[in-house]
Interface confidence: medium
């Protein structure tokens, strides 16, 4: 997959990190771990994971995501008390229901984005994914009530294939190639557009090759990829213009793609 | 009994697509109680697991972060297999290469095994 | 990810022996753990399923024990087919994990 020029923007932002070694690149050391740790990304301004062998390395490492951010993200524990107080719903709200893998039956509630409420499910005991609730009310205080949410939206198509649902990263891919994210556009975590703008570009499972666009939230701009003719995401526009349109100022809403089942 | 055979190259050159392919005999890719993965082993890392599709009236995957940006699991139900595709590979992708089935995490059937070489 | 950390790394042990393997979860996995043992040139094959599940057809000499992170393959009575490299994974959270793996030699 060719990306235009102009897609991929990367050059150093001016922001300042609070320590020097938050500027060092990530470095897994000589040894042969595999450690999950965190580290500063000068480029994208966020914390990331990389994973790290064991020993050497530098300081530019972090066992915890919060740990990372505290240390190098300017204000970052201003905002973490606003985000905790309810301005923000977190990503793993927007993940599909995961039964898991096991076969236990357990009542659990998870937060759904069609109806825009948290609802029962049943979970097998095992695996799944963060959108998974002991009791409504954790559910709706996480999930459904957050004090400054996105505004509702009512034409969402939920994906036929669910991608990755442990885990919601702040990197974005294009059929599995990792896209540069440029500094000077809003985080991730910024973002206060529609849920399915976030998505990763997902190719879908059949055999077409299709011209689409899709946002990346991380560089503001819509990135061409192929998609496959069904399955996929909603973070699917046949055009770019319909694709900054609906995500860059939500003036349209998502069209379906005729997904074929 | 269920069986899986794997099939793909055992010879892949840095910066190019490793694919590999697990046939299954006796269940089904979309039987809503098995799981399908993908492990590899090396002598450097030993049993790694990379990621699984499940289907469960829908299909889902996950996949491990250290690969996570260069992996796709695919189902294809048509022939009654799985697909796995680790884009832009490097020598440290040389292992012996295993699918296997499991009903949860328990992976009880296994492929032969495909060694892949990563090498120009 | 959840660390998995066998004990010992390798051993010597001779026919008739009783043999013990510990596996150390770096977080509790309650009883989401499984042994496999594998023999060179040959795939793992599944022992043990949930810590103390015996898989059909596997000896009963062969038994788990554990809960929470730590973790026990006993073979009572070791067999010249025995001799092999033993792995525990837990499958409490994503990623699946290993252990390193203990290989067990004739004395």
């Known amino acids: 997959l060719s990306e235009e020029a102009d897609d991929t923007d990367s050059e150093l932002g001016s922001m300042k990190p609070l320590h020097t070694f938050c500027a060092m690149k990530a470095d897994d050391g000589p040894c042969k771990a595999m450690i999950r740790s965190y580290f500063f990304n000068m480029y994208t301004h966020q914390c990331e994971e990389f994973i790290y062998g064991g020993c050497e390395g530098n300081e530019n490492r972090f066992d915890t995501l919060e740990e990372c951010k505290k240390t190098c993200i300017p204000g970052y524990e201003k905002t973490a008390v606003k985000a905790a107080s309810g301005a923000e719903r977190p990503d793993f709200c927007f993940l599909e229901e995961d039964p898991g893998l096991c076969r236990g039956y357990m009542k659990r509630y998870l937060y759904n984005n069609q109806t825009k409420q948290c609802e029962r499910f049943v979970y097998g005991g095992c695996l799944g994914n963060r959108n998974n609730f002991e009791t409504l009310d954790e559910c709706k205080k996480i999930c459904e009530n957050p004090v400054h949410s996105p505004s509702p939206v009512n034409e969402v198509q939920m994906s036929d294939y669910v991608t990755d649902g442990n885990t919601v990263t702040d990197r974005s891919t294009v059929n599995n190639i990792v896209v540069p994210q440029s500094p000077k556009v809003p985080r991730r975590r910024d973002y206060r557009g529609r849920p399915w703008c976030l998505q990763p570009a997902d190719s879908g499972l059949c055999k077409a090759s299709e011209r689409r666009f899709y946002y990346n939230s991380a560089t503001g701009k819509c990135h061409r990829f192929n998609y496959t003719g069904c399955g996929g995401n909603n973070n699917n526009f046949t055009t770019r213009r319909r694709c900054l349109r609906s995500c860059k100022t939500g003036l349209i809403k998502n069209k379906s793609k005729g997904v074929v089942k | 009994q269920v069986q899986l055979q794997q099939s793909g190259p055992g010879l892949v050159k840095p910066s190019q697509t490793l694919s590999l392919t697990c046939a299954i005999s006796g269940d089904s890719v979309s039987s809503s109680s098995a799981a399908w993965s993908w492990i590899r082993q090396s002598p450097g890392r030993g049993l790694e697991w990379l990621g699984m599709i499940y289907y469960r009236s829908k299909w889902y995957n996950h996949y491990a972060v250290s690969v996570k940006s260069r992996i796709t699991i695919n189902p294809d139900t048509s022939k009654n297999q799985f697909s796995l595709q680790l884009n832009s590979v490097t020598p440290e992708d040389t292992a012996v290469y295993y699918c296997?089935?499991?009903?949860?995490?328990?992976?009880?059937?296994w492929g032969q095994g495909t060694l892949v070489t990563v090498s120009s | 990810d959840i660390q998995m950390t066998q004990s010992p790394s390798s051993l010597s042990a001779s026919v008739g022996d009783r043999v013990t393997i510990t596996c150390r979860a770096s977080q509790s996995i309650t009883n989401y753990l499984n042994w496999y043992q594998q023999k060179p040139g040959k795939a793992p094959k599944l022992l043990i399923y949930?810590?103390?599940n015996l898989q059909s057809g596997v000896p009963s000499r062969f038994s788990g024990s554990g809960s929470g992170t730590d973790f026990t393959l006993t073979i009572s009575s070791l067999q010249p087919e025995d001799f092999a490299v033993y792995y525990c994974?837990?499958?409490?959270?994503?990623?699946?994990?290993f252990g390193q793996g203990t290989k067990v030699e004739i004395k």
């Open positions: 949930d810590v103390s």
């Open positions: 994974q837990q499958y409490s959270g994503y990623p699946l994990t």
């Open positions: 296997a089935r499991g009903g949860s995490g328990v992976m009880d059937v």
